[in-house]
Interface confidence: low
């Protein structure tokens, strides 16, 4: 292997100086081949300062970090090189604002599977302005990042995410944004027309229910959007128009719990002719009981009635 | 460093059973989506089944579907292909292989060693 | 399902030599195309995704280019261990087919 274990005893470098070119901090396993220092799994309670400056991929999953403070990777001189960031499974239970400040060339960063009770709205955008300077970010990956009930702040989960990703408009520059596995029951009006670069956006194995106040009409560059395993009952006529027009989609609606009543017909009569659907043959009603496992392609407007019973409220979300 | 090791392959007779495994590590295997793809002695590679990071969705080639099964443990890191009813025309190196994360994410972008699988009277 | 043709199915080369193999697709995927290097006995290696995007690690005289249903991947200087079959790969749907493959063998 090309990567280098640092001796314990290098911890004490004085983390005032920049670091020399072959150290490598504590605990971690470095290659200035690869450009790559990984502190992965050792407990560590806080980023190590002597971080070597030619580090372009930076692991430190699997540690024990639960603050991330403002500047917690700023250095000088800077880290100009770091472009992607790993920072899953840290146990991090709060990022404050200005936490990522001071990496330019900062392209990917992953806070995946962190118990996030405290996400600061001005995380990424580094601060309080109305316009920040953009944030050199093209990749976020925040799956999992939802906290236990008992941590949760008061204000919604949702909210406090969307906060944090239109904050400055810092983020507009950014390609690939994965929010998913974090219980969202909404997807708040405003994020997307804030994200207007966006290539790839997977919101799946969420709690979602409906697209109704959702826009994703600026959004002219999406090519993925995932949006699996959440809990969808019918996609709206708006909905469908404004995805039928983004050029280069692919939309992929596996395991949500279709109603297939009487308001899934424009759905039915769409899903029949687009080509935006991946895997629309595998797409199936999961309500009524009478049309459970019923695959939507298959069905026709005879097939599709409301039960004149149930009040209107009911019939549909 | 990633690495994915297959196991279970072997010799079997038509119509009978394995079961491969694929034990991955050196990265977060619950957050990627995987595939089984099988490569024929001589010939090119055939994708053969996907399953999505969560389990929750899989696909399957349509040479093999009703007679293999992918699943998943995150628990345990591994990858699973229950293969039934095999046929002479299965007979193959069998690779599991991480689906890719960046901006296009549908590449596979590591590879396992691979295990032969031959089925053969 | 998309089908990927690749040309030639085999050629000659000798080291230095700058090779191109090329891949077309039964309908547009845009740029999604990924090409691997597979040698003797081992497992398929990454070389280059999303048709132009050089893999980490992969040295530069790789490149990719093309869009909509023609590419071409280029070695621009052959190495001795360049020599090995190359397939390309369409990403545009979440199942995987791929090319036929193309063998590159010392002249």
């Known amino acids: 292997s090309s990567f280098s274990s640092s001796a314990p005893f290098l911890a004490s470098a004085a983390s005032a100086q920049p670091p020399l070119p072959d150290q490598c901090p504590a605990l971690c396993e470095c290659s200035e081949a690869a450009r790559t220092v990984k502190c992965v799994n050792r407990n560590l309670t806080e980023v190590p300062t002597d971080l070597p400056l030619y580090v372009r991929n930076l692991f430190l999953t699997g540690n024990q970090l639960a603050v991330l403070p403002a500047g917690a990777f700023a250095r000088r001189p800077p880290l100009a090189e770091l472009a992607a960031l790993n920072l899953s499974g840290s146990r991090l239970d709060e990022v404050r604002a200005g936490a990522f400040e001071h990496l330019p060339s900062l392209r990917q960063l992953d806070l995946s599977h962190n118990p996030l009770a405290y996400l600061s709205p001005f995380a990424f955008s580094g601060s309080n302005a109305s316009i920040s300077a953009p944030s050199p970010l093209v990749e976020l990956i925040l799956n999992h990042i939802v906290p236990p009930d008992d941590k949760r702040q008061n204000r919604s989960f949702e909210g406090m995410v969307a906060a944090a990703l239109v904050a400055g408009r810092a983020l507009q520059g950014l390609h690939l944004l994965e929010l998913a596995s974090n219980h969202f029951l909404y997807l708040p009006r405003d994020v997307l027309a804030q994200l207007p670069s966006l290539r790839y956006l997977d919101l799946s194995n969420n709690s979602l229910v409906s697209l109704t106040y959702v826009s994703f009409r600026n959004l002219t560059h999406l090519e993925s959007l995932h949006l699996e395993d959440n809990a969808l009952k019918v996609l709206h006529n708006g909905t469908l128009a404004e995805l039928q027009g983004l050029p280069h989609v692919r939309v992929f609606l596996d395991n949500n719990p279709w109603v297939c009543d009487c308001h899934m017909a424009d759905m039915v009569t769409w899903l029949k002719q687009t080509e935006v659907v991946q895997g629309k043959d595998r797409l199936t009603c999961a309500f009524p009981e009478k049309m459970r496992n019923r695959v939507l392609l298959e069905l026709n407007s005879a097939d599709l009635d409301c039960d004149p019973i149930l009040p209107p409220s009911l019939q549909t979300s | 460093e990633v690495q994915l090791l297959e196991s279970g392959g072997g010799l079997v007779q038509p119509g009978g059973s394995l079961r491969l495994s694929c034990a991955a590590s050196?990265?977060?295997?619950?957050?990627?989506?995987m595939s089984w793809v099988r490569q024929a002695p001589g010939k090119g590679l055939e994708w053969v089944s996907s399953i999505y990071y969560s389990g929750s969705g899989t696909y399957y080639a349509d040479s093999v579907k009703g007679r293999f099964t992918i699943s998943r443990d995150n628990s345990k890191n591994t990858l699973y292909l229950q293969m039934n009813s095999l046929r002479a025309e299965d007979t193959a190196v069998y690779y599991c292989?991480?689906?890719?994360?960046?901006?296009?994410?549908?590449?596979?972008?590591?590879w396992g060693q691979g295990t032969l699988v031959t089925v053969s009277s | 399902d998309i089908q990927m043709t690749q040309s030639p199915s085999s050629l000659s080369a000798s080291v230095g030599d700058r090779v191109t193999i090329t891949c077309r697709a039964s309908q547009s995927i845009s740029s999604y195309l990924n090409w691997y290097q597979q040698k003797p006995g081992k497992a398929p290696k990454l070389l280059i995704y999303?048709?132009?995007s050089l893999q980490s690690g992969v040295p530069s005289r790789f490149s990719g280019s093309g869009s909509g249903t023609d590419f071409t991947l280029t070695i621009s200087s052959l190495q001795p261990e360049d020599f090995a079959t190359y397939y390309c790969q369409q990403g545009y749907y979440y199942l995987p087919t791929f090319g036929q493959g193309t063998k590159l063998e010392i002249k």
């Open positions: 050196g990265f977060t295997f619950s957050g990627s989506s």
């Open positions: 292989a991480r689906y890719g994360r960046n901006v296009h994410p549908y590449n596979l972008d590591y």
């Open positions: 999303a048709a132009s």
